[in-house]
Interface confidence: medium
């Protein structure tokens, strides 16, 4: 299973964007896969 943790975008410069998390199975106990910061 997969879950996407919040991460903050560093591009374009000065814009911090937070993605919405993914809960593909609707479960609370999904393992978290974190996306790295991108600059």
């Amino acid at each position: 299973s997969y879950s996407m943790e919040h991460f903050r975008w560093g591009k374009p410069v000065g814009k911090k964007r937070r993605p919405v998390k993914v809960y593909p199975n609707g479960a609370e106990d999904e393992s978290a896969e974190a996306f790295p910061l991108e600059f």
């Epitope: 996407m4 814009k15 937070r18 993605p19 919405v20 998390k21 993914v22 809960y23 609707g26 609370e28």
Partner: antibody, heavy 110, light 112 residues
Framework: QSLEESGGRLVTPGTSLTLTCTAS????????ILWVRQAPGKGLESIGM?????DTYYATWAKGRFIISRTSTTMDLKIISPTTEDTATYFC???????WGQGTLVTVSS | DIVMTQIPASVEAAVGGTVTIKCQAS??????LAWYQQKPGQPPKLLIY???TLASGVPSRFKGSGSGTEFTLTIGDLECADAATYYC??????????????FGGGTEVVVK
């Protein structure tokens, strides 16, 4: 786990209306919750969302028209001054997921 | 705000055939794209997330591809049960000056 929307009804233009999203099996405050609407026979339209930490963001067209808030057990969507164009089924969604409510129908008519 | 353009609006194909739906984002969203299936009177059902990852229980006949601004959903070996409207959704994220969650206009799939 499930979500249920409530509060949809027939209202006259300009009469504010608050819709409520209630979760079963999990805590709303621990997840990102998105509000989406769908006018009859039309496509899906993203209104805005609240992150688990309480930050809220709105589509540009929705700013000033809707307010998303939450209590310890519910997530609310207030339609500030409805117009006939706000007639739609309103869904709350747990992030990007298979968990959508069944929707609540709002009809705005004079 | 992100704008998602989805084509075609409607497509018809025979049982056993293949349908391809395209979705274009107004700016790069990397792989932050989901595909949903919606049938009348029901809420949407998640098919694919991260552009190409199948959600739980979704048959491998459904395939998502693409990244950046161009994405594709391919449905192979069509079944009557696949008749529905399909939507793409970006979830690139948001800031005070940008809202990255948007849906395509939908594609109605008619199975003959």
């Amino acid at each position: 786990q499930s979500l249920e929307e409530s509060g949809g009804r027939l209202v006259t233009p300009g009469t504010s209306l608050t819709l409520t999203c209630t979760a079963s099996g999990f805590s709303l405050s621990a997840y990102d919750i998105l509000w989406v609407r769908q006018a009859p026979g039309k496509g899906l339209e993203s209104i805005g969302m609240m992150y688990d930490d309480g930050d809220t963001y709105y589509a540009t067209w929705a700013k000033g028209r809707f307010i998303i808030s939450r209590t310890s057990t519910t997530m609310d969507l207030k339609i500030i001054s409805p117009t006939t164009e706000d007639t739609a089924t309103y869904f709350c969604v747990k992030g990007v997921s298979n968990i959508w409510g069944q929707g609540t129908l709002v009809t705005v008519s004079s | 705000d992100i704008v998602m353009t989805q084509i075609p609006a409607s497509v018809e194909a025979a049982v056993g055939g293949t349908v391809t739906i395209k979705c274009q984002a107004s700016q790069s969203i990397d792989s932050s794209l989901a595909w949903y299936q919606q049938k009348p009177g029901q809420p949407p059902k998640l098919l694919i997330y991260s552009a190409s990852t199948l959600a739980s229980g979704v048959p491998s006949r459904f395939k998502g591809s693409g990244s950046g601004t161009e994405f594709t959903l391919t449905i192979g070996d069509l079944e009557c049960a696949d008749a529905a409207t399909y939507y793409c959704q970006s979830y690139d994220g948001s800031s005070s000056s940008y809202y990255g969650i948007g849906f395509g206009g939908g594609t109605e799939v008619v199975v003959k």
